[in-house]
């Protein structure tokens, strides 16, 4: 009778996480009597599968009864494939023998791979807002595919963005992989509504590609712009001063009113009109009681933007009967502490 | 249903010869090591003889050149030809089934006695 | 020749005891060990194959175990029917051999 062959007939077979995996492995014998074993990799350092003589191994499953005694077939079944599964398999014969088992006879092994899906790409912003003009970076993570191959793409608003770099890890071969990817993006004032999308393509995805999306709005700071304008009145001893604060985001604001470097009134804005590209607007108004000034006042609208340095606008009010309606504005963007007086530097 | 069944034993004078039948059914007999099994009276279980799938077969020393072991696939019989038998001989003999993969005994017929007497 | 011993020879005990007997081979043997139960005027019973791994249809209470040189076959709690006498086998290689048997009688 011829001498035994161990036939592993797949050089490779490719399993998706989660799924069973089956290994084929056929005898042309039974001689000589002894168990089959299956091993993962080769050498001193492989480990046991599946033991026909004894041992418990809940994942595996014989493919073919192996109680019969005409069976050749000692195909294996592996429930539950995860990428740590990956790696050649060996269907081996073994003698009966006596301290140890002594291997007869190996097939020649039978690679499985683990196609394993990405995890749902996470992208993450600047941890500090950025005013429009500035670049801030943008990085997207995925993780545990396999096999390494993989394409990821950048989006802003549907446009495909070109400054970024990307890195998958390890480098060499390994059960699972990682991607990592930072993008750069130049923020501009209409970025309130805008969107960044990493996209990540991959064989497990049968074309239907991963998105991770970021808000530019959680990334941008857009600071105001300050308007201070005095309003006619019927009466003549009142004056009626407005501050228009525009286009600014996000929302948090407060305002602080000064009558020649004095603070008059401190408020929070609330109520905010939202423009159409996301940002707001807010008017605050002083009522000035023109009888309680023998001079000219200044007026000064400061503005704390999104726990920025204030930036403020003044207005000089002039109590002239003959002028009531006229007057010149000043704007200063320095840091003026509430109860600073006009032209302090800050 | 899987049975081994014995026959062709009795009573022999030293010196005479038997032939043992075991009759499988159940299972191809040919795709099992056999094996015969003896107790004398009141003694233990003795190892006999086999024959493997090949055909290989393997003997006991002191019944060594005096026992034959053979099968006929066609039948699907095992038999065990005794030549020279002694006193010692006396004794239930058994035939065994070896397991699939280790050849452990799994299935056991009910065994046939063999009286070697003058 | 592979010798296997085994002890005691025979063992009282009552029915609901947990009983051992041991088996020692001259020289490892790997782990095919087997064990067999056999009561007066009948065939043997094969029980457990590779020291520990028990036949189809043997119950649970009958346990193997060891590996080399030294095996046990434990009855977890006997009942009237496992009183019988039972051998210990080494089939590593031929010759196969026995243990000369342990009788389990009734106390």
């Known amino acids: 009778e011829d001498e035994l062959q161990v036939i592993q007939p797949e050089k490779s077979v490719s399993v998706a996480a989660g799924e069973s995996a089956t290994l084929r492995c056929a005898m042309t014998s039974l001689i000589p009597v002894g168990p089959i074993m299956w091993f993962r990799g080769a050498g001193a350092g492989r480990e046991l599968i599946y033991n026909q003589k004894e041992g418990h191994f809940p994942r595996v499953t014989t493919v073919s009864e192996l109680t019969k005694r005409n069976n050749l077939d000692f195909s294996i079944s592996i429930s539950n494939i995860t990428p740590a599964d990956a790696g050649t398999y060996y269907c081996v014969k073994f003698r009966k023998g006596s301290p140890d088992d002594v291997e007869f006879k190996s097939g020649a092994g039978t690679e499985l791979s683990v196609r394993a899906k990405p995890s749902a790409p996470v992208v993450s912003g600047p941890a500090v807002r950025a005013t429009p003009e500035h670049t801030v970076s943008f990085t997207c993570e995925s993780h545990g595919f396999s096999p390494r191959d993989i394409t990821l793409k950048w989006f802003k608003n549907g446009n495909e963005l070109s400054d970024f770099q990307t890195n998958v890890d390890p480098a060499g071969d390994s059960v699972s992989y990682s991607i990592h990817s930072t993008a750069r993006v130049v923020l501009t004032r209409g970025d309130v509504h805008s969107q960044v999308i990493c996209e990540i393509a991959h064989i497990t995805l049968q074309g239907d590609p991963l998105r991770g999306t970021a808000n530019l709005s959680e990334a941008i700071r857009v600071p105001p712009t300050l308007e201070v304008t005095q309003q006619p009145m019927r009466a003549e001893n009142q004056a009626n001063v407005t501050c228009q604060v525009s286009n600014f985001y996000p929302r948090g604001l407060q305002l602080t009113w000064l009558e020649n470097g004095n603070v008059s009134r401190t408020e929070t804005a609330s109520t905010l009109i939202e423009n159409k590209d996301g940002t707001y607007n807010w008017m605050s108004w002083l009522l000035v009681n023109t009888c309680a000034h023998r001079d000219d006042v200044v007026l000064t609208c400061q503005v704390e933007h999104d726990g920025q340095q204030a930036v403020s606008k003044s207005y000089a009010l002039e109590i002239s009967a003959h002028q009531k309606e006229h007057g010149s504005d000043i704007t200063h963007e320095a840091a003026l502490a509430p109860t600073a007086p006009l032209g302090g530097s800050g | 249903e899987v049975q081994l069944v014995e026959s062709g034993g009795g009573l022999v004078q030293p010196g005479g010869s038997l032939r043992l039948s075991c009759a499988a059914s159940?299972?191809?007999?040919?795709?099992?090591?056999m094996h015969w099994v003896r107790q004398a009276p009141g003694k233990g279980l003795e190892w006999v003889s086999a024959?493997?799938?090949?055909?290989?077969?393997y003997y006991t020393g002191s019944v060594k050149g005096r026992f034959t072991i053979s099968r006929e696939n066609a039948k699907n019989s095992l038999y065990l030809q005794m030549n020279s038998l002694r006193a010692e001989d006396t004794a239930v003999y058994y035939c065994?089934?070896?397991?699939?993969?280790?050849?452990?005994?799994?299935?056991w017929g009910q065994g046939t006695m063999v009286t070697v007497s003058s | 020749d592979i010798q296997m011993t085994q002890s005691p020879s025979s063992l009282s005990a009552s029915v609901g005891d947990r009983v051992t007997i041991t088996c020692r081979a001259s020289q490892g043997i790997n782990n095919y060990a087997a064990w067999f139960q056999q009561k007066p005027g009948k065939a043997p019973k094969s029980l457990i194959y590779?020291?520990?791994s028990l036949h189809s249809g043997v119950p649970s209470k009958f346990s193997g175990s060891g590996s080399g040189t030294d095996f046990t076959l434990t009855i977890s709690s006997l009942q009237p029917e496992d009183f019988a006498t039972y051998y210990c086998q080494q089939y590593v290689s031929y010759p196969y051999t026995f243990g000369q048997g342990t009788k389990l009688e009734i106390k």
């Open positions: 590779t020291a520990s």
């Open positions: 159940g299972f191809t007999l040919s795709s099992y090591d």
């Open positions: 024959i493997g799938t090949a055909g290989d077969t």
């Open positions: 065994v089934r070896g397991g699939v993969w280790d050849d452990a005994f799994d299935i």
